[in-house]
């Protein structure tokens, strides 16, 4: 059976990953577009997130605006929003399961049930990690594709925002934490009735001879 240290490490990494997904979801920096005006005072940096966009003027003044409707959100970010929210919910379930199945908690008495719960928590964290890595990587793929598109104007290239890097880190933590929890094998203790039955059978055999 995996050591308590490994289990604690797995839960800690997964919880950190869960918090990072929330940060990734909240930060309005999925895509960054620098509009460099020919007149320097007209330059602006645009940050696009899942919930709002922000405009930073050349003066340093920043204005953020929550999207009026779902239709105002680019389609790839609409899908990303859905997947990231589901990932947060799924990871929350993973945290709950890992608390229930933890070696240092008394929610479950049976060690075997605890171990199985911990494996399920690990699988849940792995799923949450995959749900983050997909939209983050897809958004990054679209940005990179645009970067090498000859039809896209110079100076108008979109760049990967901090949220994408946070998202990758979050998925890494969730996958690593989930992986460690999946190493939690159920205990292989012999059941008492089996031992008694086997002893009884061998005694009977020796009497017979």
């Amino acid at each position: 059976m995996a050591s308590m240290g490994l289990q604690v490490m797995g839960i800690a990494l997964a919880v950190l990953g869960w918090l990072a997904v929330m940060l990734c979801c909240a930060l309005p920096m999925w895509r960054v577009t620098a509009f460099i005006g020919s007149n320097i005072v007209t330059s602006q940096t645009i940050w696009e997130g899942l919930w709002m966009n922000c405009v930073v003027q050349s003066t340093g003044q920043m204005q953020c605006k929550v999207y009026d409707s779902l239709l105002a959100l680019p389609q790839d970010l609409q899908a990303a929003r859905a997947l990231v929210i589901i990932s947060i919910i799924v990871a929350a379930l993973g945290v709950l399961l890992s608390v229930v199945g933890g070696k240092c908690t008394n929610c479950l008495e049976d060690e075997s049930a605890k171990a199985k719960t911990m494996i399920v928590a690990g699988v849940v964290f792995l799923l949450a990690g995959l749900m983050v890595i997909v939209p983050v990587s897809w958004t990054a793929h679209n940005i990179i594709q645009d970067f090498y598109n000859p039809l896209v104007a110079s100076g108008q290239k979109r760049e990967m925002g901090a949220s994408l890097y946070v998202g990758w880190a979050a998925s890494g933590l969730l996958l690593l934490g989930g992986g460690l929890l999946c190493c939690n094998c159920p205990p292989r203790t012999d059941k008492p009735y089996s031992a008694k039955y086997s002893a009884a059978r061998s005694a009977a055999a020796s009497n017979y001879v």
Epitope: T33, F35, I36, G37, S38, N39, I40, T42, I46, N53, A72, P74, N149, P150, L151, V152, A153, S154, G155, Q156
Partner: antibody
Framework: EVQLVESGGGLVQPKGSLKLSCGAS????????MSWVRQAPGKGLDWIAT??????????HYAESLKERVTISRDDSQSMVYLQMNNLKTEDTAFYYC????????WGQGVMVTVSS | NIVMTQSPKSMSISVGDRVTMNCKAS??????IAWYQQKPGQSPKVLIF???YRFTGVPDRFTGGGYGTDFTLIINSVQAEDAAFYYC?????????FGAGTKLDLK
């Protein structure tokens, strides 16, 4: 202050050729895409062509309806952009504007090109 | 080839009114739209880029919106100096096609 000054316009015969020039100042010319837009009298804006910057190998983009007859070029050392127009038609009569960046955040005052016999 | 269709072709309104003009792209262009204002005898000026971002110095009565194929330019509390032609344009990707324009007159 950004300044774009077009020149080379005037009266041209149908099937003739013309080269428009645009001198730029007040900004880092070599860092910006440059474009030509025209406007026939009393009509709307009509994008003609755009030329990108050196890091994009001076990629050129043309309006489908005009690409056989026009060529855009630039000279970064002189801060100039050019529009070569061939096989001119009467419907090419318009004001021709030189613009910078995308979106077109600065425009010249325009130069008139009249195609008539 | 992408086509930008603007409506209405012209409108006549009073000072203080709220105006909405539309631009429809023949295919999905994301938020890659700019709006320009052109007053008689002048060169055009950019008002909005990336569908909803006001260009520096543009009054906040001008608001852009939309995504994909349908876009709007709203002018809240129209002023006398807003009488002009308004054009939408596909930006970011070539071809940088313009709409036919909307003429805004004041009563």
């Amino acid at each position: 202050e950004v300044q774009l000054v077009e020149s080379g316009g005037g009266l041209v015969q149908p099937k003739g050729s013309l080269k428009l020039s645009c001198g730029a100042s007040g900004f880092g010319f070599s860092s910006y895409a440059m474009s030509w837009v025209r406007q026939a009298p009393g009509k709307g804006l009509d994008w003609i062509a755009t030329i990108s910057i050196k890091t994009q190998n001076y990629a050129t983009h043309y309006a489908e309806s005009l690409k056989e007859r026009v060529t855009i070029s630039r000279d970064d050392s002189q801060s100039m952009v050019y529009l070569q127009m061939n096989n001119l038609k009467t419907e090419d009569t318009a004001f021709y504007y030189c613009t910078v960046n995308i979106p077109f955040d600065n425009w010249g005052q325009g130069v008139m090109v009249t195609v008539s016999s | 080839n992408i086509v930008m269709t603007q409506s209405p072709k012209s409108m006549s309104i009073s000072v203080g009114d709220r105006v909405t003009m539309n631009c429809k792209a023949s295919q999905n262009v994301g938020n890659n739209i700019a709006w320009y204002q052109q007053k008689p005898g002048q060169s055009p000026k950019v008002l909005i880029f990336y569908a909803s971002y006001r260009f520096t110095g543009v009054p906040d009565r001008f608001t852009g919106g939309g995504y994909g194929t349908d876009f709007t330019l709203i002018i809240n509390s129209v002023q006398a100096e807003d009488a002009a032609f308004y054009y939408c344009q596909r930006i970011y990707n070539s071809p940088y096609t313009f709409g036919a324009g909307t003429k805004l007159d004041l009563k």
